[in-house]
Structures are given as structure tokens and as C-alpha cells.
């Protein structure tokens, strides 16, 4: 806590201007009015003060706003955002997505702190849903940030959102979390032609259900072995050979190289060894000619 | 190559002046707070002052105006003008980076120049 | 006045010890420290910064604690290119600093 010391004679700020980088921590204190601050912060960001500094000037601020600063100063906060502590944020409203753009952008570089995390999580829950341009830009600064949230969270972004995804936003999703997204992102993208309604979907297809992959078999897809590898692998199990080398095209190749990952261990391990035979890639493991194959799975739906 | 390389350092008499000099390479000085830290021979780091990207300048206590920190942008150079020397002012004088625009770690640092004052 | 004190002024210590640096600051700097590294006859290298975060390229066996007046630099394994000098410096303030710098700890070989 400062102390309340009085303001030396002639040296009572006018304006928030550079002269103040040469007050001392208690001059600041006794001479720049916290009112004054709030309406001049804008001229905050474009002077040098040091941590020191700063940290008086938040000290006044919070004096000024004890429930919390109201959106016309906290959009001028710039580098004095990085004082922040999350309590302090959750007391904000944020509502103005320049306002979220122009934090965002003091952070930039650095990974996502508890600061910005409290932010972002203000601002969505603010608005109700991980809207477009909200999502735009927060991908834009962490592209990371889908993958950071919640399956349930997830649930809450309207596929029209998904337009604005790019693929190495999707790098860290997990199953659970593109099992969400995938659904979304194909009525996102449902009315586009093949090639390129796949180049879009590609990147969720983690996500995608055995009858989804099927139907992208018959369409000369040619599917990367990066993006075979990430499928589900309850989803590429009832896959056929036929349909496994359709899904791929060129790419085919690429199994015998990866054999002994899932998900294509486990798919060899279901195919007859004659099938994969025809692929003529010296793929083994495959269930021997003239066994018998039982799904007990399907018997004990029957049943 | 980014890289900060001091001159201008050698053998000076008491009471004269002299200047050093710290060219940058690599990184443009004027977007960053600039530092000069001396080091006399088997002492500690001791730190004479810093130009911050507005060109404001701030000194230890003891340097009480015998020195002087500028900077030219137009040839990315940071000096230290030293006069009145002493011998207690023997040391090798490193310019150094502040990881900020007013204040905090030198994150890169010159090679050092080895200023002498003696008669 | 900010004034940085660091203890021991030396130690001495072998190959794989733990080894632990202090630094007191006069007055709460909050996390606003670094630590350095100097060899003979070379600049200080910056270790880590705000009290904590490693500067890149330096080995995870360097950690530091502290916030407030408090400081740690710790070696978890003492390896034969860290014997060198080691310096704290605060990060807080540019007014009423007589030296940014703590005095120094000398790490020798035992």
C-alpha cells in the first residue's frame, strides 16, 4: 500500500502525458487523478512506465472502479492488461469484440495465461456461443484455442462457425473433441461439391462415423495416409479392402509403412489375408483362408 | 546474425572523457530499451543506466551526470559518454538489450570494451 | 531504494550436487527478477526471467522460485560447464536503483 503523501507544488498532472515516466512511485500516486486516468488511458499504452509504474496506475484505477472497470477504459488498457489478475477480469464485462481483439493483442506471443483465458471465457460465455468472428479471432491469436476447450463447451459452436476453423487449429483435438465438431462441420459444409466439400472436412474427419468414410470411398477422395492414421479406429474397422484402397487411391501404399500402428493394425487384423493380398503391398496379419469369422458383437444384438 | 559489438574502450587519463560506442546488428534498436552495464576487473555486474524507446534516460544513484546515454536510430548505435574519469571507472562496459520498452532483462548482450583510467 | 543482497557471495560444490542461489530484494519486486550466468571473461548470458520462465536454450536443470523480496535459482544437477558466476537482477523499477544487480555467487569446483 502506497501512502497518502501530498502532491509537490507544480508537479499535478494535467494530462496523461511522457513527463509522467519521471514521477517516482509516490509522486504517481499523489499526483495523477484516478478520474483523469480512466478518460485519458487511451495515452496509457504509448509511454514507457515500468512495472512499477503501471502498477501504481492499476492501484488507482481499482480505487475508482471497485466492482470493475467499465468497457471504455478496459478497452485502453494495453500493456496494463498484463497486471491484471484473473479476479480482476471476472469482474468485467466485455462485450465489444474490439475491445477482446485489442487485449488479445498485448499478449500476443506469449502462450494463453490465466489472464487471457479468464477473458476469453468472459467474453464467449457474454455472448452465449463461440460466434464466427469470435472465433476467428481467438483462432487467430491461439490456434490451439478449439482444442482447449471441453467437448460439452464445444457443443456450443454453431456450425456456421466452423467456417472459420483452419486445419492446425484442429492439430490438438483429441477423439472426444472432434467427435463434436465433425457433425458440425459437415452440415457446415454439406452443400459443397466433392473435392471440395472434402479438402473442407478433411481435418474433422477424426471424428467421422464408419458410414461417412464409406461414402467418401466412392468418391475418389485420395486421402493422405496422415489423415488415415487420425481416423477412429471403431470407425475404420468395418471398412473393406476394396473400399480402404478406394479411400486412399495413390496413398494405399502408405499402409505397409505404418502396419504396425493403429488404426491399420487393427483393420488388418480383421480383413481376410487373401483381400489384403490383392493389394499386393506384403501386408500379414490378416485372418488365414478358410477360417470362419463370428462378430459376436452383432450375436449378442440379436440375442 | 543479431549481435551487439561495443568500442571505443582503451587507456584514458583521470579527469578526461571519452566515448563509447555499441552498434547492433541484426535488430533494430530503436524498438527496444537500451542498457549499459559495467564490470570492473574481478567485481560484480554494476548498472550505469537506460535509454528507453522514447529516448528517456535513467541512471544509477552513483553515476550523478558524469555519464550520458544516447542513441542514434538513423545508425542503430547506442553510446555511453563518460567524462571526468577516475580509476575506479576502470571496467569492461557492456551495452545490453532490455526486454521491454521501458524496463527488465537484458536478454542480449555486447562482448564488452575494457575502458583503463590511469595516468 | 531497491537494493538486491544475494547469498553466498561463493560455494563450492561437485559434479551433480543440487545447488541453491538466493537473492533478497529490499523491497517487494513482485516476480519482476532474473538470473544470469557469466564465464570468465564473457558476457553474462540471461538464464531466466520474471523470477521463474527459462530463456530459450537453456537447460531445464536451471529452475528459479521466488515472488515479492524472495529469490532461488536452483542447479538440480551440478554439470562441469556450469561453474561460472551467477547474478540476479530486478526487473521492477529504473528509479531510486543505486545497482540493479545483486552482488554475485561464485560457483567453484569442490
Known amino acids: 500500500e502506497v501512502e497518502k503523501t501530498a502532491c509537490p507544488s507544480g508537479k499535478k498532472a494535467r494530462e496523461i502525458d511522457e513527463s509522467l515516466i519521471f514521477y517516482k512511485k509516490w509522486e504517481l500516486e499523489a499526483c495523477v487523478d484516478a478520474a483523469l486516468l480512466a478518460t485519458q488511458m487511451d495515452r496509457v499504452n504509448a509511454i514507457p512506465f515500468t512495472y512499477e509504474q503501471l502498477d501504481v496506475l492499476k492501484h488507482k484505477l481499482d480505487e475508482l472502479y471497485p466492482q470493475g472497470y467499465p468497457e471504455s477504459v478496459i478497452q485502453h488498457l494495453g500493456y496494463l492488461f498484463l497486471k491484471m489478475s484473473p479476479e480482476d477480469i471476472r469482474k468485467w464485462n466485455v462485450t465489444s469484440l474490439e475491445t477482446l481483439k485489442a487485449l488479445l493483442e498485448v499478449n500476443k506471443g506469449h502462450e494463453m495465461s490465466p489472464q487471457v483465458a479468464t477473458l476469453i471465457d468472459r467474453f464467449v460465455k457474454g455472448r452465449g456461443q463461440l460466434d464466427k468472428d469470435t472465433l476467428d479471432t481467438l483462432t487467430a491469436f491461439y490456434p490451439g484455442y478449439l482444442c482447449s476447450l471441453s467437448p460439452e463447451e464445444l457443443s456450443s459452436v454453431p456450425p456456421s462457425s466452423i467456417w472459420a476453423v483452419r486445419p492446425q487449429d484442429l492439430d490438438t483435438c483429441d477423439p472426444r473433441q472432434l467427435d463434436v465438431l465433425y457433425p458440425k462441420a459437415r452440415l457446415a459444409f454439406q452443400n459443397m461439391n466433392g473435392s471440395e466439400y472434402f479438402v473442407k472436412i478433411q481435418s474433422f474427419l477424426g471424428g467421422a462415423p464408419t458410414e461417412d468414410l464409406k461414402a467418401l470411398s466412392q468418391q475418389n477422395v485420395s486421402m493422405d495416409l496422415a489423415t488415415f492414421m487420425k481416423l477412429r479406429t471403431d470407425a475404420v474397422l468395418p471398412l473393406t479392402v476394396a473400399e480402404v484402397q478406394k479411400l486412399l487411391g495413390p496413398h494405399v501404399e502408405g499402409l505397409k509403412a505404418e502396419e504396425r500402428h493403429r488404426p491399420v493394425r487393427d483393420w488388418i487384423l480383421r480383413q481376410r489375408q487373401d483381400d489384403l493380398d490383392t493389394l499386393g503391398l506384403g501386408l500379414q496379419g490378416g485372418i488365414p483362408n478358410g477360417y470362419l469369422v463370428l462378430d459376436l458383437s452383432m450375436q449378442e444384438a440379436l440375442s | 546474425q543479431v549481435q551487439l559489438v561495443e568500442s571505443g574502450g582503451g587507456v584514458v587519463q583521470p579527469g578526461r572523457s571519452l566515448r563509447l560506442s555499441c552498434a547492433a546488428s541484426?535488430?533494430?534498436?530503436?524498438?527496444?530499451?537500451m542498457s549499459w552495464v559495467r564490470q570492473a576487473p574481478g567485481k560484480g555486474l554494476e548498472w550505469i543506466g537506460v535509454i528507453d524507446i522514447s529516448g528517456n534516460r535513467f541512471y544509477a544513484d552513483w553515476v550523478k551526470g558524469r555519464f550520458t546515454i544516447s542513441r542514434d536510430n538513423s545508425k542503430n548505435t547506442l553510446y555511453l559518454q563518460m567524462s571526468s574519469l577516475r580509476a575506479e571507472d576502470t571496467a569492461v562496459y557492456y551495452c545490453?538489450?532490455?526486454?521491454?520498452?521501458?524496463?527488465?532483462?537484458?536478454?542480449?548482450w555486447g562482448q564488452g570494451t575494457l575502458v583503463t583510467v590511469s595516468s | 531504494d531497491y537494493q538486491m543482497t544475494q547469498s553466498p557471495s561463493s560455494l563450492s560444490a561437485s559434479v551433480g550436487d543440487r545447488v541453491t542461489i538466493t537473492c533478497q530484494a529490499s523491497?517487494?519486486?513482485?516476480?519482476?527478477l532474473a538470473w544470469y550466468q557469466q564465464k570468465p571473461g564473457k558476457a553474462p548470458k540471461l538464464l531466466i526471467y520474471?523470477?521463474?520462465d527459462l530463456a530459450s536454450g537453456v537447460p531445464s536443470r536451471f529452475s528459479g522460485s521466488g515472488s515479492g523480496t524472495d529469490f532461488t535459482l536452483t542447479i538440480s544437477s551440478l554439470q562441469p560447464e556450469d561453474f561460472a558466476t551467477y547474478y540476479c537482477q530486478q526487473g521492477y523499477t529504473r528509479s531510486d536503483v543505486d545497482n540493479a544487480f545483486g552482488g554475485g555467487t561464485k560457483v567453484e569446483i569442490k
Open positions: 541484426g535488430i533494430d534498436l530503436s524498438s527496444y530499451a
Open positions: 545490453a538489450r532490455v526486454d521491454s520498452r521501458a524496463w527488465g532483462p537484458f536478454n542480449l
Open positions: 520474471d523470477a521463474s
Open positions: 523491497q517487494s519486486i513482485f516476480s519482476y
